[in-house]
Amino acid sequence: MADGSSDAAREPRPAPAPIRRRSSNYRAYATEPHAKKKSKISASRKLQLKTLLLQIAKQELEREAEERRGEKGRALSTRCQPLELAGLGFAELQDLCRQLHARVDKVDEERYDIEAKVTKNITEIADLTQKIFDLRGKFKRPTLRRVRISADAMMQALLGARAKESLDLRAHLKQVKKEDTEKENREVGDWRKNIDALSGMEGRKKKFES
């Protein structure tokens, strides 16, 4: 078996792997350096992709910030008149300052009133929401916080105890339901796990996934 594999390595195109029925086959297959199952994406490529994604995200954030600035500018330009100071004397400029101060005071008062109304509305909404929950006999909605969580932990949190017995997400994702192959290799188990274990990938994989 090993000979066949090494022959294939000397040819320009690698031959397909032999049908694997015994665990010894897998061991030999795994220990052959030329036939070692490589990760589809190298670590440097992963890093490159991560960096690219971060760059794109950064650009998006900058674009959004720029859009917000532009929106603010547009809003201000519709609300604030340009200062037309040309030809105005010192007297008019002083008067204008008084006018603008008065306008600022007025806007401040309006802002204070609006904030008070908003606060009142928020309180009313909270009270009404609470009443709705009370009427439905439901618990009070907790305040949500943003948390870092893995997919497994999320499933655990969502499904509780059932998650352990019913759902191993990654196992589900990796399972290939081909009846013939399953019958043939029933005694073998998951050959990928064997390869990972033998090549020392298991530990690294766990680290990466966590």
Epitope: G89, F90, A91
Partner: antibody, heavy 119, light 113 residues
Framework: EVKLEESGGGLVKPGGTLKLSCAAS????????MSWVRQTPEKRLDWVAT????????FYPDSVKGRFTISRDNARNTLYLQMNSLRSEDTAMYYC?????????????WGQGTLVTVS | DIVMTQSPSSLAMSVGQKVTMSCKSS????????????LAWYQQKPGQSPKLLVY???TRESGVPDRFIGSGSGTDFTLTISSVQAEDLADYFC?????????FGAGTKLELK
Amino acid sequence: EVKLEESGGGLVKPGGTLKLSCAASGFTFSSYAMSWVRQTPEKRLDWVATISSGGSYIFYPDSVKGRFTISRDNARNTLYLQMNSLRSEDTAMYYCARHHNPDKSGFAYWGQGTLVTVS
Amino acid sequence: DIVMTQSPSSLAMSVGQKVTMSCKSSQSLLNSSNQKNYLAWYQQKPGQSPKLLVYFASTRESGVPDRFIGSGSGTDFTLTISSVQAEDLADYFCQQHYSTPLTFGAGTKLELK
């Protein structure tokens, strides 16, 4: 040559209305603040109103506030003074005046005036 | 409001004489930030509209003969005509441009003897 020409004056009854115009030429009208100044029969000069170059800022003395409205049409190079609720003390020669350059002061140019008689 | 008081109300002078007229304001017209006094002098000849002679109390407007000299600071100002000419026969008004409402003095009438 800077030229300011007032029109629209005349005889009006107390409580009446009148609209004065001032046609400007010889300078970039939209770059200067403009004012109306009146001169009573006793030769006393009274400032009536001022408007900024773009028309956003307006200034009046208390004596005319709420009764007179200054405005401008920069496309037509024209300054206006709408006078409502006229009183006998509003009788005067009404001049339109251009303010000096920003780094200077005072009314640099005056029109020939238009006479308003409230009687 | 700033009150502007001019004196004398009229004066008669002969050609070639030196003329001095006064203008007092009820409060200072000096802007401490730029050290400028916001006072202007106007000349109004009979049947004509006013003409700017001096601004910032002492700066002569372009085209105004150098015999017209503005001076003073704060609340006391003076317009001097060093050598009166026949064409100087007119009313002279001072005006403060320091604060609104803008106010004028009652004027000084210059007559020739």
